[in-house]
């Protein structure tokens, strides 16, 4: 099939006091090969400091996956989700409030 770029969605949730968990989800993409990682100041976090989801079919002939990490509240600006798929790349910031979901479709 032809290339379908991912929708990228970054959310945040409360973790322990002073910390938040940030999750980056990529969905509706094809083919399944994708790089999705959290960056701190533009530098990828070590694998063992991120939690990873499998790349799974989402039922529409496309795929989905996610990656999460824990950060200090107030340091959201330092963190971005980096995505690379089929030769295209993008970076996605952490939303400033926990009530908004940010969706971006990348071509």
């Amino acid at each position: 099939g032809s290339t379908v770029p991912p929708m990228v969605n970054v959310t945040r949730s409360e973790a322990s006091e002073g910390n938040i968990t940030v999750t980056c989800r990529a969905s509706s993409f094809y083919p399944r090969n994708i790089i999705l990682t959290w960056r701190q100041d533009g530098v990828s976090l070590s694998h063992d400091t991120q939690q990873w989801g499998d790349v799974l079919p989402d039922g529409n002939g496309t795929y989905q996956t996610w990656v999460a990490t824990r950060i200090c509240r107030g340091e959201e600006q330092r963190f971005t989700c980096y995505m690379e798929h089929s030769g295209n790349h993008s970076t996605h910031p952490v939303p400033s409030g926990n009530s908004h979901h940010h969706h971006h479709h990348h071509h």
């Epitope: 533009g42 990828s44 976090l45 990490t69 824990r70």
Partner: antibody, heavy 118, light 112 residues
Framework: EIQLQQSGPELVKPGASVKVSCTAS????????IYWVKQSHGKSLEWIGY????????ISNQKFTGRATLTVDKSSSTAYLHLNSLTSEDSAVYYC???????????WGAGTTVTVSS | DILMTQTPLSLPVSLGDQASISCRSS???????????LEWYLQKPGQSPKLLIY???NRFSGVPDRFSGSGSGTDFTLKISRVEAEDLGVYYC?????????FGSGTKVEIK
């Protein structure tokens, strides 16, 4: 080959401003942040800040807030460090640098010498 | 700001010697998620610094295996197992776990 080409030396008067450029080649410019580091003569290194060329977002050392402005021109793959209200304390070599996958300053420019003198 | 204290400031060596440089941070540089952004750089006269070690103990590409990094929390060490002439210069530790990022004051490795 990945390279960061910096602009030439600058001699400026106290109170003036200066704009140092850093032109990237050999990679997709928007993939990696550009960092700026100051080194006064015979001294250690001092982190100024960084810019994400993809979003234009910046994080800076508070010590330089209001004095240093970081910008990029994506069309020419060039990052800029603009320093204003210069004093003799700003006389230094200014480096741009680029991170890699898991490291901060994997590639460095050759440095730009800024001399502030009347 | 996190202060990075390097010792010694000067390290006279004979070629072939082992050299050890210590770097101590004023507070832990282990980030909330477990990431420790501690790096080591070598700067030779008239040159830009060059990366040796990243994330405490990982050698950068092209760096000889005589260089090794170790440590955790607040105490970090760079070791050179057998010093060669090309290793002479000023070594800096650097932390990027917390803003502002900070460098150590440097350790000059020179011939005895």
């Amino acid at each position: 080959e990945i390279q960061l080409q910096q602009s030439g030396p600058e001699l400026v008067k106290p109170g003036a401003s200066v704009k140092v450029s850093c032109t990237a080649s050999g990679y997709a410019f928007t993939k990696y942040n550009i960092y700026w580091v100051k080194q006064s003569h015979g001294k250690s290194l001092e982190w100024i800040g960084y810019i994400d060329p993809y979003t234009g977002g910046t994080i800076s050392n508070q010590k330089f807030t209001g004095r240093a402005t970081l910008t990029v021109d994506k069309s020419s793959s060039t990052a800029y460090l603009h320093l204003n209200s210069l004093t003799s304390e700003d006389s230094a070599v200014y480096y741009c640098a680029r991170p890699g996958s898991y490291w901060y300053f994997g590639v460095w420019g050759a440095g730009t010498t800024v001399t502030v003198s009347s | 700001d996190i202060l990075m204290t390097q010792t010694p400031l000067s390290l006279p060596v004979s070629l072939g010697d082992q050299a050890s440089i210590s770097c101590r941070s004023s507070q832990s540089i282990v980030y909330t998620n477990g990431n420790t952004n501690l790096e080591w750089y070598l700067q030779k006269p008239g040159q830009s610094p060059k990366l040796l070690i990243y994330k405490v103990s990982n050698r950068f590409s092209g760096v000889p295996d005589r260089f090794s990094g170790s440590g955790s929390g607040t105490d970090f060490t760079l070791k050179i197992s057998r010093v060669e002439a090309e290793d002479l210069g000023v070594y800096y530790c650097f932390q990027a776990s917390y803003v502002p990022f900070t460098f150590g004051s440097g350790t000059k490795v020179e011939i005895k």
